[in-house]
Interface confidence: low
Amino acid sequence: SAPGEDEECGRVRDFVAKLANNTHQHVFDDLRGSVSLSWVGDSTGVILVLTTFHVPLVIMTFGQSKLYRSEDYGKNFKDITDLINNTFIRTEFGMAIGPENSGKVVLTAEVSGGSRGGRIFRSSDFAKNFVQTDLPFHPLTQMMYSPQNSDYLLALSTENGLWVSKNFGGKWEEIHKAVCLAKWGSDNTIFFTTYANGSCKADLGALELWRTSDLGKSFKTIGVKIYSFGLGGRFLFASVMADKDTTRRIHVSTDQGDTWSMAQLPSVGQEQFYSILAANDDMVFMHVDEPGDTGFGTIFTSDDRGIVYSKSLDRHLYTTTGGETDFTNVTSLRGVYITSVLSEDNSIQTMITFDQGGRWTHLRKPENSECDATAKNKNECSLHIHASYSISQKLNVPMAPLSEPNAVGIVIAHGSVGDAISVMVPDVYISDDGGYSWTKMLEGPHYYTILDSGGIIVAIEHSSRPINVIKFSTDEGQCWQTYTFTRDPIYFTGLASEPGARSMNISIWGFTESFLTSQWVSYTIDFKDILERNCEEKDYTIWLAHSTDPEDYEDGCILGYKEQFLRLAKSSVCQNGRDYVVTKQPSICLCSLEDFLCDFGYYRPENDSKCVEQPELKGHDLEFCLYGREEHLTTNGYRKIPGDKCQGGVNPVREVKDLKKKCTSNFLSPEKQNSKSN
C-alpha cells in the first residue's frame, strides 16, 4: 500500500494551526453554471474568474456571466462585472491572455443576432480596466496574439475572412478572404491556407498555403495542393496531395516556406492522418496513422532537417484525427516521453523513452507492488499510465500525468500494475527520477498539483461525495498529512494553482448545494508557513540525471551529455521560493554509434549499432529517392542525432555514397525517373 501517516514520516509540526491561519474562503454570489479561471501574467497574483449561467427559455437561451478578479493569488475576489458592462461573455472563446507579462486580456462578448459584428473587451493593465470595442466581423476563433508582439492580433471571421489588428484590437483590417486556417510563425509572420472554389471542406487537398511577413501588405504563395499545414519548432510542415492519386505526403521547410523538401515518411490515404506529437528546434516526433480504422499508427523521429525519419515506435495508440493519444512530454527530465501502444490482443500498454524516441521500453514495475488481478500474464508485469485516452473512455481517472520543468525528475500519474492498462480503479504513482523508477504514492484516484518547484505536493481524493480534506506532502510523496480546510464539505470541481509550479498557494474550487440554491465557492490555502525557512545550500543534494550506476564512465549520458542537478533533499522542509532556478551542471560525453542515426538509404540491423546500406529501396523510401532533393541523396550513412552534443570518441566517417543510382523501379516510367523535383 502507499506510504501514509506512519511513525517514519517526517511530520510537519503544528501544521493545522499554520494552515488554518492561511486558508481563505470566498463564496461567489452566483448561481452555479460554469466557471473558468485564468492567471494574468507570471508572479502577479492576478486571477480572473468568469462564471456563466444559462437559463433555457422557450424561444432563446438567456445567458448571464460575472467576472471576478483577485490580485492575491485567489485569497480575495472582487466582482468587476461592471467593467464589462454586465455583458454576457462567450465561454467557448475563453479569456485570451496575452503572452509573457504583457498584462493583456481579451474577452469576446455574445451579441444579438442582427448585429454587424462582434464585440470584445480589452485590457492591457492586468484586468484593472477594460475597453469595449465593436468588431467589423463576427469572430469564428479566439483572438490570437503574435508571440513576438502582443499588440498584434489575428482572428478568423465566420465568413472565412482573415482579420489583423496592429494596435491590440482597437482597429481591425481584413487582409484576406476565403481563409481556412491561420497561424502565427516567427518574426510576426502569418501562415494561412486559402480555398479557391467552394469551401475549406470542398477544397481540402487543393488549398493554397500563403505567407505574409508584413501583416498583410504583401503575400507569397508558398504551397499548392495543400491538405493541411503545421508549425513545430523551426519546422513548417505541409501535407501535399500527390499528382497521381488521392494520397498525400509531408513536405518540410526550415526557411519559412521559401524552399521545401519531401519528408521521407509514408504517404497517407484519405482516411489517414499525420500528427506532430512534439517538436523543438532540433527535431520532431511525427505520428503517421495506419491504413484502416485501426486506432494506431507509427511514431517517427526526424533528423535535424526534418527530412529523414527513423521509425521510433510501432502500434502507437492514436484514435482518430484530433482524437486521443497518450503521448506526453515529461518536462521534468530531458529526453523523456511516455505514450501508449495498442498491442496485438487490443490491450493498451504504456511505453517510455529516455533518449528522445531512440528506444522505448515498458515502465519498471514499482518496488514491492504486485501484478494486479487483471494481468493475463503474471510473469510480464509493469506499470501502465492512464492519460488522455483513459480520460476520454470515462475511466475513473481525474487527471493526466503531471510534470514540471522546475520540479526536476518528478512525474505523477494514475496507473495500474499489470500487463496492460486496467479498467480497475487506478492508484497514483510518483517517479522522482524522470520515469526510471516508480512508487505508489496514493491509494485510489486523486487530483494533484506541484507547488514550490516540488517542495510541496498537494492532492485531493476524487470522490462523488462532498469533500473537506486536502492532503499534502513535503517529501515528494513519501509521507502525507491531511488538513480539513472547511467544516462544511463541498462538491469539488477542481484544483487550481498558478502555472509553473512556483506558487505556494492552492485554490480548491467547488460548490455548495442547499435545498434552494447552489453557489460557487473557493478555498485558497497558502503553504508559506509550512515551509518556514528559505532553503540553503545544505538542503540540496547532487543528483545525476539518467543515472543507473555512478561508476560507469558513460552513466547518465543521454544525447551526448550528462547533467548533474542540485535537488532539494526529501528530508528538507524549506522554501525553494518563487525565484528558484534549477541548478544544473552539464558535461559532454564521448560519442558512440548510438549518438548517430542512420541517414536515408541506411538502416540498423536489430541489436546492432552500425548503419548498413539498404539492399534495395522500396515503398516510400523509393519515392523519396525518386522525387527528393538530390543533395539529400549523398551521404556517408550517419547523421548526428538532433540535439546530441557528444564530442570525440567514435566518428563514423566513411566514403560518401551517391544513392541516386539506386533510384530505379519497374513501376515508374523512365521519364518520371529522370524528373527530380527540386
Epitope: 517510455i352 529516455f354 533518449d355 528506444r359 521500453t361 515498458h362 515502465l363 519498471r364 514495475k365 518496488e367 514491492n368 507492488s369 504486485e370 501484478c371 503474471k378 510473469n379 510480464e380 508485469c381 509493469s382 500494475v417 520515469g435 526510471y436 539518467h546 543507473t548 550506476d549 561508476e551 560507469d552 558513460e554 552513466d555 543521454i558 541489436n607 546492432d608 549499432s609
Partner: antibody
Framework: QVQLVQSGAEVKKPGASVKVSCKAS????????MSWVRQAPGQGLEWMGI????????SYAQKFQGRVTMTRDTSTSTVYMELSSLRSEDTAVYYC??????????????????????WGQGTTVTVSS | EIVMTQSPATLSVSPGERATLSCRAS??????LAWYQQKPGQAPRLLIY???TRATGIPARFSGSGSGTEFTLTISSLQSEDFAVYYC?????????FGGGTKVEIK
C-alpha cells in the same frame, strides 16, 4: 553476511521433475533479481533464466522454455527452480546467483551490468535410469 | 542470442607472468560484460563487472578492458591461486550468455 544456501543433491529418473531451492540471507530479498545457471560435468556455464522476487516475473532462456519454472516465496526469502521432463543431459550442478540488474529492468539499465555477485554453493542433479 | 567466444581455450603461464584472456561477442554488448573465476568443485566468483570495474575484494592485479564486441581480462602477475577457469558473460540482451571459458594452467 550475504549468503545463498541451496538444497541438497538429487538423483532423478528420466522424465521426472526436480525442484531446487535457494534461500537468501544477509540482504533485502526483494531488492535483487536471482538468476539460475547450470554446469554439466566438464562443461562451461549455461544461463537458464531469471526471476524478480518482487511480483515473481520471470524470463527464461529459449532452450528451457516450457520445461523450467522459477518461483519465489518472499516470506522465507527463497527462490525455487523446477525442471521437468528430465533427460540424461540435464545432469549438472545447478547454481542460483544474485543478479542485481535483471532483464526486466526498464530504462538504460542495459548500459551497465553489475554481474552475478553472490552464488549459491550449487546443487548436483543426476539424471539416470 | 549473442554468442560469446573466448580464446585461447587453454593458456599456459608461469607464476609471476602476465596473462591476457580474450572474449569476443557476436554483436555489440556495450559495456555489459562480466568476468568470473571458477576453481574445481567451487561456484564461480565475480571478478569484473561493467567490462572494467573490479568487484569487491578482487586484487588490483585483475583488470578488464574493452567495449562493444572485444574484451580483455588481464592478470598482471599470476599468483598460484589464480590458476583456474575464467568465463566472460554478457548481459546486453536476454538470454544472458557465457563464453566457453579459458583455462589458465601452470606452465
Amino acid at each position: 553476511q550475504v549468503q545463498l544456501v541451496q538444497s541438497g543433491a538429487e538423483v532423478k529418473k528420466p522424465g521426472a521433475s526436480v525442484k531446487v531451492s535457494c534461500k537468501a540471507s544477509g540482504y533485502t530479498f526483494t531488492s535483487r533479481y536471482m538468476s539460475w545457471v547450470r554446469q554439466a560435468p566438464g562443461q562451461g556455464l549455461e544461463w537458464m533464466g531469471i526471476i524478480n522476487p518482487v511480483g515473481g516475473s520471470t524470463s527464461y532462456a529459449q532452450k528451457f522454455q516450457g520445461r523450467v519454472t522459477m518461483t519465489r516465496d518472499t516470506s522465507t526469502s527463497t527462490v525455487y527452480m523446477e525442471l521437468s521432463s528430465l533427460r540424461s543431459e540435464d545432469t549438472a550442478v545447478y547454481y542460483c546467483a544474485r543478479d542485481p540488474s535483471g532483464i526486466a529492468a526498464a530504462g538504460p539499465a542495459s548500459r551497465y551490468y553489475y554481474g552475478m555477485d553472490v552464488w549459491g554453493q550449487g546443487t548436483t542433479v543426476t539424471v539416470s535410469s | 542470442e549473442i554468442v560469446m567466444t573466448q580464446s585461447p581455450a587453454t593458456l599456459s603461464v608461469s607464476p609471476g607472468e602476465r596473462a591476457t584472456l580474450s572474449c569476443r561477442a557476436s554483436q555489440s554488448v556495450s559495456s555489459n560484460l562480466a568476468w568470473y573465476q571458477q576453481k574445481p568443485g567451487q561456484a564461480p566468483r565475480l571478478l569484473i563487472y561493467g567490462a572494467s570495474t573490479r568487484a569487491t575484494g578482487i586484487p588490483a592485479r585483475f583488470s578488464g578492458s574493452g567495449s562493444g564486441t572485444e574484451f580483455t581480462l588481464t592478470i598482471s602477475s599470476l599468483q598460484s591461486e589464480d590458476f583456474a577457469v575464467y568465463y566472460c558473460q554478457q548481459a546486453r540482451l536476454g538470454p544472458w550468455t557465457f563464453g566457453g571459458g579459458t583455462k589458465v594452467e601452470i606452465k
